[in-house]
């Protein structure tokens, strides 16, 4: 079998054996090594010698196999844009940011660049649960049967109605999507002026 080519090696068809870890250098018509994540090209390849890589300096990174002659500068998560850090920058990975609690990503360009406050969900509704927190604005859905939510809030969840019998009480008024069940002492009649409240 033919021996494996080691960079730099000539390539007539402008493609390299390992596309992830090698690149075609058109000036020399050869395939050269890329630099691994966390490094950059310190010396470009020639027909005689391969790429030489060096480690990214502190506060800089390269995330992929590359033939960049510089490392990218680490950027902090911008609190003014509503972002907070979830993982620090390393030589191999940029700072990982997310929207602050109560916010969602309003501007996306490969990554989130700007977060805005989540919209309130009115009484009787709650924000639909999303796979990724902060990915989109709230989509308010009605509380399911047997549940209520009585505030305007971006994060309040629908709660189950109180079961009066669990407390040794009886139902005075049924719960709605916006209010809890009203319970009363089973021995006391409900006065007209007290209707709609829970009597203990």
């Amino acid at each position: 079998s033919q021996p494996q080519a080691v960079p730099p090696y000539a390539s007539e068809n402008q493609t390299c054996r390992d596309q992830e870890k090698e690149y075609y250098e058109p000036q020399h018509r050869i395939c050269c090594s890329r630099c691994p994540p966390g490094t950059y090209v310190s010396a470009k390849c020639s027909r005689i010698r391969d790429t030489v890589c060096a480690t990214c300096a502190e506060n800089s990174y390269n995330e992929h196999w590359n033939y960049l002659t510089i490392c990218q500068l680490c950027r902090p998560c911008d609190p003014v844009m509503g972002l907070e850090e979830i993982a620090p920058c390393t030589s191999k990975r940029k700072t990982q940011c997310r929207c602050q609690p109560g916010m969602f990503c309003a501007a996306w360009a490969l990554e989130c660049t700007h977060c805005e406050l989540l919209s309130d969900c009115p009484p009787g509704t709650e924000a639909e649960l999303k796979d990724e927190v902060g990915k989109g604005n709230n989509h308010c859905v009605p509380c399911k049967a047997g549940h209520f939510q009585n505030t305007s809030s971006p994060s309040a969840r629908c709660q189950p109605h109180t079961r009066c019998e669990n407390q040794g009480l009886v139902e005075a008024a049924p719960g709605t999507a916006q209010s809890d069940t009203t319970c009363k002492n089973p021995l006391e009649p409900l006065p007209p002026e007290m209707s709609g409240t829970m009597l203990m």
Partner: antibody, heavy 122, light 108 residues
Framework: QVQLQESGPGLVKPSQTLSLTCTVS??????????WSWIRQHPGKGLEWLGF???????YYNPSLKSRVTISVDTSKNQFSLKLTSVTVADTAVYYC??????????????WGQGTMVTVSS | DIVLTQSPGTLSLSPGEGATLSCRAS???????LAWYQQKPGQAPRLLIY???SRATGIPDRFSGSGSGTDFTLTISRLEPEDFAVYDC?????????FGGGTRVEIK
């Protein structure tokens, strides 16, 4: 501007090891893009490339001498060195250190030391 | 290894004359990988031309290089007294880097 200066013994006995050092002044050996080389010239003959090194320690050697040649670098002293083992009278030559110019001129040599004559004799 | 053959071995000329030096490679090295050096007695070589035709920094325009493939030429349009020296070609197309045997330009 960058200057190179070779140093080492001018006389080496057969079978011993030839050791030379090249000191870089007027610039850093750690400059990105530059390899540093050793080249020799036998009396009245042409030039012969021995090998080169990068500040990180990456080396390339002339295959005809690879088994006998070692080039190393000491960035703290801004120096690189040549060791040639098991020398014979055929290794008598002027030894030059040089900078590989990089950039558009790739593996041509743009800066040279003045050379040091090494004689192999018992 | 690529062998570089320089001719003539010696060129005897007078100041003011033009000089044409030849360097022939044993295999195709394209035009990007050939350099010319000037070397005077007791001195280190000095880079004149790289990439077959590009003048190195500070080299007078009376020096020019041409050629591609296997045949390359160094031309000195009008010889100055300081131009009398040995001229070497070098290829860096493939390892090992090799040099020609030199052409001596001497005063007639």
């Amino acid at each position: 501007q960058v200057q190179l200066q070779e140093s080492g013994p001018g006389l080496v006995k057969p079978s011993q090891t030839l050791s030379l050092t090249c000191t870089v002044s007027g610039g850093s050996i750690r400059s990105d893009g530059y390899f540093w080389s050793w080249i020799r010239q036998h009396p009245g003959k042409g030039l012969e490339w021995l090998g080169f090194i990068y500040y990180s320690g990456t080396t390339y050697y002339n295959p005809s001498l690879k088994s006998r040649v070692t080039i190393s670098v000491d960035t703290s002293k801004n120096q690189f060195s040549l060791k040639l083992t098991s020398v014979t009278v055929a290794d008598t030559a002027v030894y030059y250190c040089a900078r590989v110019c990089g950039g558009d001129c790739y593996d041509a040599f743009d800066i040279w030391g003045q050379g040091t004559m090494v004689t192999v004799s018992s | 290894d690529i062998v570089l053959t320089q001719s003539p071995g010696t060129l005897s000329l007078s100041p003011g004359e033009g000089a044409t030096l030849s360097c022939r490679a044993s295999q195709n090295i394209s035009n990007t990988y050939l350099a010319w050096y000037q070397q005077k007695p007791g001195q280190a070589p000095r880079l004149l031309i790289y990439g077959a035709s590009s003048r190195a920094t500070g080299i007078p325009d009376r020096f020019s290089g041409s050629g591609s493939g296997t045949d390359f030429t160094l031309t000195i349009s009008r010889l100055e007294p300081e131009d009398f020296a040995v001229y070497d070609c070098q290829q860096y197309f493939s390892s090992p880097i090799t040099f020609g045997g030199g052409t001596r330009v001497e005063i007639k």
